[in-house]
């Protein structure tokens, strides 16, 4: 039975040209995290394997930095970066847990961070 929950940074906003940290945290399970995949709708951004390190997709390599931790830093944001991002935790023996983050990239200099929320 999958008992874990993923806590994410929730709905967040950031300024065009700036950067943002996408962060998820898996709790309430003793399952071992083998890797975390970061995806944006249909695209793979990066993979962090707990043992083998990071894979950064070539189409994002100039704008994505690994970390902190299992998180991902998106840089040089554009309005086109607005949308859903998913952290997919591959765990043993539980299986897969998915967290969702919605990022809005604003033209304006007013960019507020949304509250954290949990996905069971």
């Amino acid at each position: 039975m999958m008992t874990g929950t993923i806590e994410t940074t929730g709905n967040i906003s950031a300024e065009k040209g700036g950067s943002i940290i996408l962060q998820c945290h898996l709790s309430s399970t003793t399952a071992q995290v083998t890797q975390v995949n970061w995806e944006q709708q249909d695209q793979l951004l990066a993979i962090c394997n707990a043992d083998l390190g990071w894979h950064i997709s070539p189409s994002f390599k100039d704008r994505v930095a690994p970390g902190p931790g299992l998180g991902l830093t998106l840089q040089s944001l554009t309005v086109n970066d607005t949308g859903e991002y998913f952290c997919i935790y591959h765990t043993y023996p539980d299986g897969t847990y998915t967290g969702r983050i919605f990022l809005e990239v604003l033209e304006s200099s007013v960019a507020e961070h949304g509250a954290r929320f949990q996905i069971p």
């Epitope: 083998t34 890797q35 995949n37 995806e39 249909d42 695209q43 793979l44 993979i47 394997n49 707990a50 043992d51 083998l52 390190g53 990071w54 894979h55 950064i56 997709s57 070539p58 189409s59 390599k61 690994p66 591959h90």
Partner: antibody, heavy 119, light 107 residues
Framework: QVQLVQSGAEVKKPGASVKVSCKAS????????MHWVRQAPGQRLEWIGG????????SYSQKFQGRATLTVDTSASTAYMELSSLRSEDTAVYYC????????????WGQGTTVTVSS | DIQMTQSPSSLSASVGDRVTITCQAS??????LAWYQQKPGKAPKLLIY???YRYTGVPSRFSGSGSGTDFTFTISSLQPEDIATYYC?????????FGGGTKLEIK
Amino acid sequence: QVQLVQSGAEVKKPGASVKVSCKASGYTFTENAMHWVRQAPGQRLEWIGGINPNNAGTSYSQKFQGRATLTVDTSASTAYMELSSLRSEDTAVYYCTRSSYYRYDLDYWGQGTTVTVSS
Amino acid sequence: DIQMTQSPSSLSASVGDRVTITCQASQDIKTALAWYQQKPGKAPKLLIYSASYRYTGVPSRFSGSGSGTDFTFTISSLQPEDIATYYCHQHYTTPWTFGGGTKLEIK
């Protein structure tokens, strides 16, 4: 230039162990994970596992968990793969191969080591 | 484990022909796919990474495309030196797995 040079062919009896080495040169050894892939005669390539020389973290295919052991000697820029409890089905060519910097594709390969298991 | 199904398993073509090999993953792997060329008695060589990026020094006649579960590897104009077995490889999640290979021969 990057080179991965493996140890020579081995003939082993069923139940024995084999340890294959892979000496890396031409790059910073700790910056790329090292993987082991085998190919039995006429078969597809099969991933055994990988090791991160930076922290000795290992990831194994479940099929080889407990039977394969991956290690590194960073001072000698050498990776090792030990396979125990050998059986005839383990007869194969064993390759060491490194993954690209910040990517998981396998960009350089050793020349292969033939391991024959026969009574 | 993710199964990789490659087709055809063998194919015969003439010099100058356009050759297409397909690889199907048993689940969505986004673009976490590479293609390798292996000649008899030799180690594999990386040709294409992340589904569509040509590796350094690989001739432009080799290309890859696809995302999700369906991928294609193409040789636009077959050359005699392209005779080899070609493999796809997924690294979306461990254990990493390979296709069964496509053996390419000259007619």
